[in-house]
Interface confidence: low
Amino acid sequence: SEGRKTWRRRGQQPPQPPPPPPLPQRAEVEPGAGQPVESFPLDFTAVEGNMDSFMAQVKSLAQSLYPCSAQQLNEDLRLHLLLNTSVTCNDGSPAGYYLKESKGSRRWLLFLEGGWYCFNRENCDSRYDTMRRLMSSKDWPHTRTGTGILSSQPEENPHWWNANMVFIPYCSSDVWSGASPKSDKNEYAFMGSLIIQEVVRELLGKGLSGAKVLLLAGSSAGGTGVLLNVDRVAELLEELGYPSIQVRGLADSGWFLDNKQYRRSDCIDTINCAPTDAIRRGIRYWSGMVPERCQRQFKEGEEWNCFFGYKVYPTLRCPVFVVQWLFDEAQLTVDNVHLTGQPVQEGQWLYIQNLGRELRGTLKDVQASFAPACLSHEIIIRSYWTDVQVKGTSLPRALHCWDRSFHDSHKASKTPMKGCPFHLVDSCPWPHCNPSCPTIRDQFTGQEMNVAQFLMHMGFDVQTVAQQQGMEPSKLLGMLSNGN
């Protein structure tokens, strides 16, 4: 993303990660007699279909891999540029997708990449100069490694490790909403929505036609892209004669608020522009499309409202699981709260707390959600996505519970099964009051900080807050250090 990153997070640092939380359930793979294999527990319960035929495939695969057993299985997703070259990135180069097939599985995961947006000629030119990969396919690598929810390793992806994985690079800069080609009038193409449609069409010829479930997922702008496109994907599949494919959404870090900025600023560049201003301008510049049912709720010129999760969600037909940090860095960036490592002022601190409260309020009626009280941005394709817990439940577990709710009757069950929750929103009030939040490191020293250190670093006034809570400062500090 374009925003300045103040806090460095696990996975971006060479030092040892903190003690990891538990890994996924996996049935174990039995090593061959005396074979020094790099084996790990595998979850065969995730294998759909005929077990015998699956085991036969495994046996034949094992035999063919035996000579190179020291090498790792290829985890990469392979690039396919769209055959329909009229569906393009901003610069007119063909859009595309990365695919890793899983022949035994009828689950398909389509992931929409994020990366902000641009909404006028100036900031799109600037984006083209500095972040060309997000506007052109010309320099895309031939392969990508699947991480987090795109990983085929059960320990990294207990949720859907066995699924067919598709990564759709973001090269349209339009929050996946556009449907306008490059022309004499338009220097750039904005075809995000059409790219998704075209990828789905092409995948039908690569096995998607036999899918049981298509999960459209995305992070950041890709998360908002999920909200904007999930119903349209379901409609497309119905039109093309595949009504039995269940389409669901997973929107990560794309549930933004059209709130008032902490400090009002002019809409000069992408990251300082208030959310509503940026989207109002963008939707015109991109010829952006929003879901039809949402569009009908707002008068002409007000379609920008549909880019905001809490407004579009109630209009969606497809089930959507919302993942959102309560203190999202991108939200704070557009709200002009810049955490530069200097202690924050009291006004900022109250603004941040209030943001968490507001966000929590918007998730009240969202059936499936996971919202930890952390200062962060994006999670589902981070390799530490299994680590964070809300009320003792990890995200992969919550997704598993959500999945199960569809099996227990054909309708999405509104009440989660006992012990298998999927509406998980933190209720503690400060950033990182959840002890499983991604580790924070001091930007300058690289040192890990505990919650108490972090909050004090941000100017958190222990005395005042302890007074407000009616407790001893030392007790409050102890609670914070333990993450309570």
Epitope: P22, Q25, E28, P36, V37, K418
Partner: antibody, heavy 119, light 111 residues
Framework: EVQLVESGGGLVKPGGSLKLSCAAS????????MHWFRQAPEKGLEWVAY????????YYADTVKGRFTISRDNAKNTLSLQMTSLRSEDTAMYYC????????????WGTGTTVTVSS | DIVLTQSPASLAVSLGQRATISCRAS??????????MHWYQQKPGQPPKLLIY???NLESGVPARFSGSGSGTDFTLNIHPVEEEDAATYYC?????????FGSGTKLEIK
């Protein structure tokens, strides 16, 4: 309360058979892989067998392969271990244990049932 | 199979002091930043009880005087300060592959 209770142990002659059961309660049994372990008198813990949550996968220790069969009935929340061709070295306390769905450790154990193989 | 060598076989520690138990694996049991080593306590006539999972995570309900550390092949369980009720046999267990094996146990006696 999360609980596992074994039953079915007893005295049996070498070459005989016995079926152990493990009744689960207090949790969603069908979510978890289950294991059997044993502990000979004054000895350490030994893994015996594993069954995945949906019964699709089973594994056995080399010492019991071909003689013991692990099974489960998710509708009845029951895990079983059918033991045949018993030998004196199978004498032990047998425990069923729940494998936590994260990470390969055993967070719930039964109280155990004693199997004695002797003529 | 991965062999876990536990030491010492037994130890006697005074009340309030520190008990340290080591476990060495015959092969690396850590991967991708995770260490598949766990610790259990067993008292006579009782089943094992999980204390520490994934090398250093305290199982819910276990007193904070128990702690685990280590990675790769070498792992340690510390108990400090030792209390009367900690007299038991302690086992390490790996889950890096099948079969999951246990150390031979360390018997802790309180002086």
């Amino acid at each position: 309360e999360v609980q596992l209770v074994e039953s079915g142990g007893g005295l049996v002659k070498p070459g005989g058979s016995l079926k152990l059961s493990c009744a689960a309660s207090g949790f969603t049994f069908s979510d978890y892989g289950m294991h059997w372990f044993r502990q000979a008198p004054e000895k350490g813990l030994e893994w015996v067998a594993y069954i995945s949550s949906g019964s699709r996968t089973v594994y056995y220790a080399d010492t019991v392969k071909g003689r013991f069969t692990i099974s489960r009935d998710n509708a009845k929340n029951t895990l079983s271990l059918q033991m045949t061709s018993l030998r004196s070295e199978d004498t032990a306390m047998y425990y069923c244990a729940r494998k936590h769905y994260n990470g390969g450790y055993f967070d719930v154990w039964g109280t155990g049932t004693t199997v004695t193989v002797s003529s | 199979d991965i062999v876990l060598t536990q030491s010492p076989a037994s130890l006697a520690v005074s009340l309030g002091q520190r008990a340290t138990i080591s476990c060495r694996a015959s092969k690396i049991v850590s991967t991708s930043g995770y260490s598949y080593m766990h610790w259990y306590q067993q008292k006579p006539g009782q089943p094992p009880k999980l204390l520490i999972y994934l090398a250093s995570n305290l199982e819910s309900g276990v007193p904070a005087r128990f702690s685990g550390s280590g990675s790769g092949t070498d792992f340690t369980l510390n108990i400090h300060p030792v209390e009367e009720e900690d007299a038991a046999t302690y086992y390490c267990q790996h889950s890096r592959e099948l079969p999951p094996t246990f150390g031979s146990g360390t018997k802790l006696e309180i002086k």
